[in-house]
Interface confidence: low
């Protein structure tokens, strides 16, 4: 049959080469002469020429030694053709398997491995894992099967077999008790990897095992008793530094101290922190101490480590006697901020309130008072009694000094201690409104057309508070009601000004009297600019031109006639009608009305 079973060839063969491996044979050679050839990687494609075939006999030849670690299997095709080149067989698969020889030593993945384990651990505790590789085959042979072992241990204390290594996994474990960091902080193991599962080639590496500190020593206070002096009221004040000694590894969790106030701090006045470098306990005041309440505190402080103890250890305790030193304390206003209601505009010299301070010190110290900040200069304070009186007119409506009806004053109290101390208090005067302001309109200048005029709405404001404000009442005075009307809206907070008679283009004074709900009256003059226009206007347009704007000499003559007529009529009116001087503009306006009639006729 045109079939070849897989061919096994050992790597690293010694030859001689070419070496006959197997013969390809087609049964078609009875009928005709057959020529044999091979193709594929290792024959006619890279790596070319490793294999060849005798053309006429069909012998498969190996031309050179093979390397399994380079190519473990070759897949070739055998071909059979007749003399005329025609294929007599289908291409045949030829598998050549390269069998392994133990031609590689194991290699560790690192020259030096590093691991760590806590001191005092029990046998069986895993430390670390090491790894070696071997390029040889470990599936069909033992050539690449690595076995691990410990060749040596340094130092050999407490004895030379402190560690073991798992033969196949490379896991290093503790095999004996007695690991003591204080005695041996680090072991160096020379480890071996041997192929053939321990019977072949060997290579070595180093495994360093660091012995980590376990918390087998308690921190101890040295000394155990302290006395300290602290001024009263000091917050964040360093009271005392407590010193401890610990035999564990410096700066490790087993060495770093954790302090706890076990007793004597009922009011939670103290706190203790660990200095990160010196490991001292820094006792400080969290709150101010009060000499008058308690002049001595006895604290009991316990020290442990950040890391838990690995065995039962006694904890060390220190005693700190804290003496509180008296200081002259500042007087304290009662209350610190005092709210007083007072009517605005009270007479000068009238009392406002009494505002006094208390001294926390036990001695009966004399307290004197003065005003520290009085922006408007409205008040005075009796230095002995703390009596506050008005020396100026309190004005609720003074926006420079009064905010939200409140006038703020800062007062000072000083004791006669040595040295004297001062305390401040805040006096908040809530000024009660009186009806001392009348209503005023806004705006006070208006512009209005003299034909189909638009009503002018003016807002009414009053600096006082309710009920001294709206509803407001409006009244026109000084004959302003001849040409104008003033009406207050339903809400009573705006006034509507209307022109009820024709006025010529000019500026007029409208005399308006407004009164509030408390009948406080305020007279205001509204400056009204009347324009020759219809309806709404912002500013007056150009001079009035009557008729259809026709010009020329005719128009000029009419203008002269109108002026003469106005002058005559004006003279008559002045003589006949006796009016106040300030009504002159309104009188001219009447004459203008007559002039308008002339114009309309002319038109």
């Amino acid at each position: 049959d045109w079939v070849v079973a897989p061919i096994s060839v050992p790597e690293n063969g010694k030859g001689p080469f070419p070496q006959r491996l197997n013969q390809l044979k087609s049964n078609k050679d009875r009928d005709t002469k057959i020529f044999y050839s091979i193709t594929g990687p290792g024959a006619d494609s890279p790596p070319e020429g490793v294999f060849a075939v005798e053309k006429e006999t069909g012998w498969l030849l190996l031309n050179k030694p093979l390397d399994r670690e380079e190519i473990a299997k070759y897949e070739l095709f055998g071909h059979a053709v007749s003399e005329n080149g025609a294929s007599v067989e289908d291409p045949m698969n030829i598998s050549i398997i390269v069998t392994d020889q133990n031609d590689h030593k194991p290699k560790f993945t690192q020259d030096t491995f590093r691991g760590s384990v806590l001191e005092g651990v029990l046998p069986g505790t895993s430390v670390m894992q090491v790894t070696a590789t071997d390029e040889d085959d470990a599936i069909y042979t033992y050539n690449g099967v690595v076995a691990y072992s410990i060749h040596s241990q340094e130092p050999k204390e407490p004895h030379d077999l402190m560690f073991t290594i798992h033969k196949s996994t490379g896991t290093i474990s503790v095999i004996s008790s007695g690991l003591d960091r204080e005695k041996v902080p680090e072991y160096t193991l020379t480890i071996q990897a041997t192929d053939m599962d321990g019977d072949g080639s060997t290579t070595t590496a180093v495994a360093v095992v660091e012995i980590l500190d376990a918390n087998d020593n308690a921190p101890m206070f040295d000394p155990q008793k302290y006395e300290a002096h602290v001024p009263e009221n000091a917050v964040g004040h360093e009271v005392q530094r407590l010193t401890v000694t610990d035999l564990d590894a410096p700066n490790s969790p087993a060495w770093r101290a954790t302090y706890l106030i076990m007793g004597g701090d009922d009011g939670d006045h103290f706190t203790i922190t660990t200095h990160p470098e010196s490991n001292q306990g820094i006792l400080t005041t969290r709150k101010g101490l009060d000499f008058e309440a308690k002049n001595q505190h006895t604290l009991y402080v316990e020290v442990t480590n950040e890391a838990p103890f690995v065995l039962k250890l006694p904890t060390s305790t220190a005693t700190i006697v804290v003496h509180v030193e008296d200081v002259n304390e500042a007087p304290v206003f009662v209350p610190p901020s005092k709210v007083v209601e007072v009517q605005e505009g009270i007479p000068t010299g009238e009392p406002v309130c009494v505002y006094t301070a208390e001294d926390p010190d036990k001695e009966n110290q004399k307290i004197s008072y003065r005003i520290l900040r009085d922006p408007a200069g409205w008040l005075a304070m009796d230095p002995d009694s703390g009596q506050v009186t008005a020396v100026g007119t309190l004005d609720r409506e003074d926006e420079q000094f009064v905010r939200n009806n409140i006038y703020e004053v800062m007062v000072l109290a000083m004791d006669n201690g040595s040295p004297p101390t001062t305390g401040t208090g805040t006096l908040l005067l809530t000024l009660i409104d009186v009806n001392d302001h009348g209503p005023v309109p806004e705006p006070r200048q208006i512009t209005i057309c003299n034909q189909s005029p638009v009503r002018q709405v003016l807002n009414i404001t009053d600096k006082d508070l309710s009920p001294h404000t709206s509803p407001f009442q409006a009244q026109l005075t000084d004959d302003s009601d001849i040409y104008w009307t003033a009406e207050v809206n339903e809400e009573g907070d705006t006034v509507v000004l209307s022109l009820k008679k024709f006025l010529k283009q000019d500026t007029y004074d409208v005399h308006l009297s407004l009164s509030d709900h408390g009948n406080k009256e305020q007279l205001t003059v509204i400056r009204a600019t009347v324009c020759d226009c219809h309806g709404h206007v912002e500013t007056c347009p150009g001079p009035w031109k009557g008729g259809s704007g026709g010009g020329g000499s005719g128009a000029g003559v009419i203008a002269v006639i109108v002026v003469v007529v106005i002058a005559i009529v004006a003279g008559i009116v002045v003589l006949v009608i006796s009016r106040k001087k300030r009504m002159a503009k309104y009188e001219k306006a009447e004459i203008k009305e007559m002039g308008e009639m002339h114009r309309e006729l002319n038109a």
Epitope: P250, N251, S252, P253, R256, T258, T273, T274, P276, E277, T304, E306, A307, P308, F309
Partner: antibody
């Protein structure tokens, strides 16, 4: 690795106490410290305290007098108890695992956090 | 207690931009014995728990994208995001674990334009 906070009622009356349980899985409380951190609404984070692998504790000094942290290693549970609650204790309370038990682990950094439980203090 | 101050309190950047935020401590966080800075950075996305990004001031926590970098020493620290992504919208907090109590900064809110 998972941390789950379970609390009693989310609403606590002023002056009453608060208890929260943090149940962990995927690691042992004998290997990792557990921290408690809170976050008032719309504000930043505030560390409350820690319980070490051996059961030791450290507290924020301002809260020490009314805060207790304890644990049950066998049940993988850590407990926070806070007394005398006031309105400014209203916050989301988180438990968070330290990176490791030793300094060289960066123990003060917290690598796994619970989802937090909201506590409202109101009358 | 040790005070941590973060700046700015908020900032808005476009996707792809580089962003830096600062954290200052009231005392040095560098421990001379091991030359490590006891500082961590966290990210808190809206409605989520904080997530550890950086510890020892510059060591990236496993699984954290390498666009996040922590730097600085002593009292001045910086978190840098080399190229901001939309998913980085969060508040970033620094935290010291040099001394008790552990304290956090007020946070920097990162908004995406």
């Amino acid at each position: 690795v998972q941390l789950v906070e379970e609390s009693g009622p989310g609403l606590v009356a002023p002056s009453q106490s608060l208890s929260i349980t943090c149940t962990v899985s995927g690691f042992s409380l004998t290997s990792y410290p557990i921290n408690w951190v809170r976050q008032p609404p719309g504000k930043g984070l505030e560390w409350l305290g820690v319980i070490w692998t051996g059961g030791g504790t450290n507290y924020d000094s301002a809260l020490k007098s009314r805060l207790t942290i304890s644990k049950d290693n066998s049940k993988s549970q850590v407990f926070l108890k806070m007394n005398s609650l006031q309105t400014d204790d209203t916050a989301r309370y988180y438990c968070a695992r330290s990176r490791g038990a030793y300094d060289f682990d960066g123990r003060g950094a917290m690598d796994y956090w619970g989802q937090g439980t909201t506590v409202t203090v109101s009358s | 207690e040790l005070v941590m101050t973060q700046s700015p309190s908020s900032l808005a950047v476009s996707v792809g931009e580089k962003v830096t935020m600062s954290c200052k401590s009231s005392q040095s966080l560098l421990y001379s014995s091991n030359q490590k800075n006891y500082l961590a950075w966290y990210q808190q996305k809206p409605g989520q728990s904080p997530k550890l990004l950086i510890y020892w001031a510059s060591t990236r926590e496993s699984g954290v994208p390498d666009r996040f970098t922590g730097s600085g020493s002593g009292t001045d620290f910086t978190l840098t995001i080399s190229s901001v992504k939309a998913e980085d919208l969060a508040v970033y907090y620094c935290q010291q674990y040099y001394s008790y109590p552990y304290t956090f900064g007020g946070g920097t809110k990162l908004e995406i334009k």
